[in-house]
């Protein structure tokens, strides 16, 4: 008889995670008598996957009925494949021996690669908000995919971004890989409704990429603009002054009126008007009893937005014998000290 040969017909097999992998092996002879074993890897550190003679291998089933006298097919199927199962598998024929069987011949090996889907991309934005014209960074992470080849793209409102840096780890061979990408986005005033999307394409996704999103509303702060005006008089001894707070985001806003530097009233913005671009407007008014003032009054509208340093705008209300209805306004960025009268 010709000497027994161990034939592993496939050099490589690729299987999706969760599926079963069939590893084929055939002998050309029944002689010499002895069991076959399957190993992952070679050398002293090889891992026993299946032993025809003894042991319990719950994930392994034999393709043929190995106890048939004339069986020459020693293919196995491994169920519920994970990336950790990747490696080169060897079908090894042992020759009966006493007390122990002796390794007789090995197949050439079959490399099992596992196709594992990337996890859903997680996009995270900056820890603190930034104002328009500033650049913020968004990160995108996905894990557990194999093989290593992967494509990542960034979009802002459907437009592809180019300012990003991507790393796939580890650099060498691994059972699975992770991707990390950082994109730099320049904020604009209209970005409250904007969205950034991280899109990942991989062989396991069959042309249907995974997407992770982040809303720029979580990253942007649009500071308010202030306008203080005097409204027509309701009565001869009263002046109605309004503070229009416009185009701010997010909502959190506290307004304080000062008369000649002294706090008159503090209120928190409640009923806001939302603009089309997602920013908000709010108006506050102050009724001034002109009889209580001999001199001109400087009215200051001071706004603290989103925990930032206060901004203010002042208005000089003239007190005259004839209760004239005119004045001029003064703007102060974070001016907490009383405004000098005009």
């Amino acid at each position: 008889e010709d000497e027994l040969q161990v034939i592993q017909p496939e050099k490589s097999v690729s299987v999706a995670a969760g599926e079963s992998a069939t590893l084929r092996c055939a002998m050309t002879s029944l002689i010499p008598v002895g069991p076959i074993m399957w190993f992952r890897g070679a050398g002293a550190g090889r891992e026993l996957i299946y032993n025809q003679k003894e042991g319990h291998f719950p994930r392994v089933t034999t393709v043929s009925e190995l106890t048939k006298r004339n069986n020459l097919d020693f293919s196995i199927s491994i169920s519920n494949i994970t990336p950790a199962d990747a490696g080169t598998y060897y079908c090894v024929k042992f020759r009966k021996g006493s007390p122990d069987d002796v390794e007789f011949k090995s197949g050439a090996g079959t490399e099992l690669s596992v196709r594992a889907k990337p996890s859903a991309p997680v996009v995270s934005g900056p820890a603190v908000r930034a104002t328009p014209e500033h650049t913020v960074s968004f990160t995108c992470e996905s894990h557990g995919f194999s093989p290593r080849d992967i494509t990542l793209k960034w979009f802002k409102n459907g437009n592809e971004l180019s300012d990003f840096q991507t790393n796939v780890d580890p650099a060498g061979d691994s059972v699975s890989y992770s991707i990390h990408s950082t994109a730099r986005v320049v904020l604009t005033r209209g970005d409250v409704h904007s969205q950034v999307i991280c899109e990942i394409a991989h062989i396991t996704l069959q042309g249907d990429p995974l997407r992770g999103t982040a809303n720029l509303s979580e990253a942007i702060r649009v500071p308010p603009t202030l306008e203080v005006t005097q409204q027509p008089m309701r009565a001869e001894n009263q002046a109605n002054v309004t503070c229009q707070v416009s185009n701010f985001y997010p909502r959190g806003l506290q307004l304080t009126w000062l008369e000649n530097g002294n706090v008159s009233r503090t209120e928190t913005a409640s009923t806001l008007i939302e603009n089309k671009d997602g920013t908000y407007n709010w108006m506050s008014w102050l009724l001034v009893n002109t009889c209580a003032h001999r001199d001109d009054v400087v009215l200051t509208c001071q706004v603290e937005h989103d925990g930032q340093q206060a901004v203010s705008k002042s208005y000089a209300l003239e007190i005259s014998a004839h209760q004239k209805e005119h004045g001029s306004d003064i703007t102060h960025e974070a001016a907490l000290a009383p405004t000098a009268p005009l």
Partner: antibody
Framework: QVQLQQWGAGLLKPSETLSLTCAVY????????WNWIRQPPGKGLEWIGE???????NYNPSLKSRVIISVDTSKNQFSLKLSSVTAADTAVYYC??????????????????WGQGTTVTVSA | SYELTQSPSVSVSPGQTASITCSGD?????YAWWYQQKPGQSPVLVI????KRPSGIPERFSGSNSGNTATLTISGTQAMDEADYYC?????????FGGGTKLTVL
Amino acid sequence: QVQLQQWGAGLLKPSETLSLTCAVYGGSFSTYYWNWIRQPPGKGLEWIGEINHSGSTNYNPSLKSRVIISVDTSKNQFSLKLSSVTAADTAVYYCASSHYGSGSFPDSYGMDVWGQGTTVTVSA
Amino acid sequence: SYELTQSPSVSVSPGQTASITCSGDKLGDRYAWWYQQKPGQSPVLVIYQDDKRPSGIPERFSGSNSGNTATLTISGTQAMDEADYYCQAWDSSTAVFGGGTKLTVL
């Protein structure tokens, strides 16, 4: 351990069909091959063939054209039919079990338990 | 077809060691079985897979198999060991028996 009890016609005329049955008691029917062996008077043992629970058979090439071995798992029995017998088929016929169990592989199991034997005579 | 050859007879004195041989091409690459048959009785398996003894078989029975020869050894042979002994191996899913050896205990 498995026990085997066999029966069948002991006297046949040439060209008739020999028919023997072997009943299996004890053991797991699905972990055995079931054999038939014969021994002509004053001679050595000759293997006829075997069958397992799923009906997989192997036959001695010299007898293959005349032999049918079948199995009835519902009764835990297996049978031998040898057609067109001649005087040369006169022998003691034995059934025997080959237990293969979980640690077995091809050609690692032999005939561990034998039936009591049935003498078959072919004579005109 | 594969053939196994046994010497027709072996004689041994009680208490002595009897060696019964079985030869076949590269028999050591196969498993050998040994069966004992006493007159008027069914064969009994005494050695399986070259050198293993079934339960109930006395320790004086032992086996070996290498090269082209399998050997059944009976140490301290007793009168009750007088019988025909058959070796058996498998070839291409066919059981092959040796011609048998008659052991006579003098």
